[in-house]
């Protein structure tokens, strides 16, 4: 089996649809399977067509998390198997743009996932770069939240608070509604005190390219780039 057209990597916005193409040939005509982060693809639709010993497979995905997608073409000639692989990464453009570019509005949090974490009647920043900011941000939290089910009892509440306060940032109302980022110190506390082991595992896997964790890419800010609580009492949100 030989791959003629490998799937292409994409950097897309959260909630986009992406179609990955994989074309292979061989005698006999190979079969194509798709793998997502090392496992069989759990969601998405696959369409295939065969023409002149060439198989074309299209995997359509609704993107809610980053991933490594591998196209595997296999055929069997007698007792001998022949396999060809090609991979593509789907990464998500960071939802939270630099503050000066932020366009959005302040509103009370009305979602469910962060109910126990965010203060009652919390005023949060909703990002209008989404068609439906409330739904998109809630879905973003929900997707990352599922990953937190496997972390330690010490890490989980801290990571949940970080996640909710990062995606639904405190909002400072005014002529230009402004999101208030989490203080660097709280981010570091989660990274180094509460979730040290989990963070190390996550970063190691990311470096090795095994998978791109949604917790890492979407919900965890880069601590060093956040404002410090020692700058100004209003520079950031103390959790």
């Amino acid at each position: 089996a030989r791959i003629l057209r490998a799937p292409e990597s994409h950097n897309v916005t959260f909630g986009s649809f992406v179609t990955l193409h994989c074309t292979a040939t061989g005698i006999p005509v190979p079969t194509i399977t798709w793998i997502e982060n090392g496992n069989a693809v759990s969601s998405g639709s696959i369409q295939e067509s065969v023409k002149d010993r060439v198989i074309d497979s299209r995997l359509q995905l609704f993107i809610t998390k980053p991933g490594l997608y591998t196209c595997i073409a296999t055929n069997k000639h007698g007792e001998k198997f022949s396999t060809a692989k090609a991979a593509a990464t789907i990464s998500i453009a960071e939802w939270s743009k630099p503050q000066k570019d932020n366009k959005g509005y302040c509103a009370q949090y009305r979602g469910e996932v962060c109910n126990a974490v965010l203060a009652k009647d919390a005023l949060v920043f909703l990002n209008t770069s989404y068609a439906d900011p409330e739904e998109a941000q809630e879905l973003l939290v929900h997707t990352a939240w599922n990953e937190l089910k496997v972390v330690s009892p010490v890490c989980r509440p801290a990571a949940e608070a970080l996640l909710c306060n990062h995606i639904f940032q405190e909002c400072s109302p005014g002529v230009v509604p402004t999101p208030i980022p989490i203080c660097r110190e709280y981010c570091l506390a989660v990274k180094e005190l509460f979730c040290a082991k989990e963070w190390l595992v996550m970063e190691e896997k990311t470096h090795r390219g095994l998978y791109r964790s949604e917790m890492h890419l979407l919900s965890v800010p880069e601590c060093s780039k956040l404002p410090s609580m020692h700058w100004d009492p209003t520079a950031c949100a103390r959790l």
Epitope: A189, L193, M229, H230, W231, D232, P233
Partner: antibody
Framework: EVQLVQSGAEVKKPGESLKISCKGS????????IGWVRQMPGKGLEWMGI????????RYSPSFQGQVTISADKSISTAYLQWSSLKASDTAMYYC???????????WGQGTLVTVSS | DIVMTQSPLSLPVIPGEPASISCRSS???????????LDWYLQKPGQSPQLLIY???NRASGVPDRFSGSGSGTDFTLKISRVEAEDVGVYYC?????????FGQGTKLEIK
């Protein structure tokens, strides 16, 4: 075990320069702010300023701005407090302390006694 | 700057009796997260200061439970339920709400 070890006592003359040190160990030195606190003989504690060794960002108390310089060398996990021209009124015990991620000073050095006398 | 005012400045106590130190700030130390950015430290004779209470009411690791912190906004209290001889020293409150961080003048606790 988290430790902050300060350099030894110093006796100087007015007008001389001085740099005292505070070496951190047992934790991620670049992730925590280090503060300096002055205690003049028989007096209370005064917060002088802080440094974030990760990027050498500093914040000074207005009372000490321009009087001292706070710096750090993250490669050797050490923070410094220095004077370019000492005065008799700089005679004091100087403590370095680590600001926890919640702001409080959770670990303190043993203190460096600086005596400035002609 | 936020001014921290402690009282009394001197506190003679009989061992086994309770003791209370007050600390008042010129501005509220209560943050939107519900925490008061007020800490208490004890400096024993000839030693470096040590953390007793952080964020208004949380006892630091290794601090005996006879020590407790309370209060909110601008008025705070450190209580020792039963004073022991080892509790002698100078007690300081400190605000970490905004820089420059400031300490109270200190309260000297001595045994009667």
């Amino acid at each position: 075990e988290v430790q902050l070890v300060q350099s030894g006592a110093e006796v100087k003359k007015p007008g001389e320069s001085l740099k005292i040190s505070c070496k951190g160990s047992g934790y991620s030195f670049t992730s925590y702010w280090i503060g300096w606190v002055r205690q003049m003989p028989g007096k209370g504690l005064e917060w002088m300023g802080i440094i974030y060794p990760g990027d050498s960002d500093t914040r000074y108390s207005p009372s000490f701005q321009g009087q001292v310089t706070i710096s750090a060398d993250k490669s050797i996990s050490t923070a410094y407090l220095q004077w370019s021209s000492l005065k008799a009124s700089d005679t004091a015990m100087y403590y370095c302390a680590r600001h926890s991620h919640w702001g409080f000073l959770d670990y303190w050095g043993q203190g460096t006694l600086v005596t400035v006398s002609s | 700057d936020i001014v921290m005012t402690q009282s009394p400045l001197s506190l003679p106590v009989i061992p086994g009796e309770p003791a209370s130190i007050s600390c008042r700030s010129s501005q509220s130390l209560l943050q939107s997260n519900g925490y008061n950015y007020l800490d208490w430290y004890l400096q024993k004779p000839g030693q470096s200061p040590q953390l007793l209470i952080y964020l208004g009411s949380n006892r630091a690791s290794g601090v005996p439970d006879r020590f407790s912190g309370s209060g909110s906004g601008t008025d705070f209290t450190l209580k020792i339920s039963r004073v022991e001889a080892e509790d002698v020293g100078v007690y300081y409150c400190m605000q970490v709400q905004q820089t420059p961080y400031t300490f109270g003048q200190g309260t000297k606790l001595e045994i009667k």
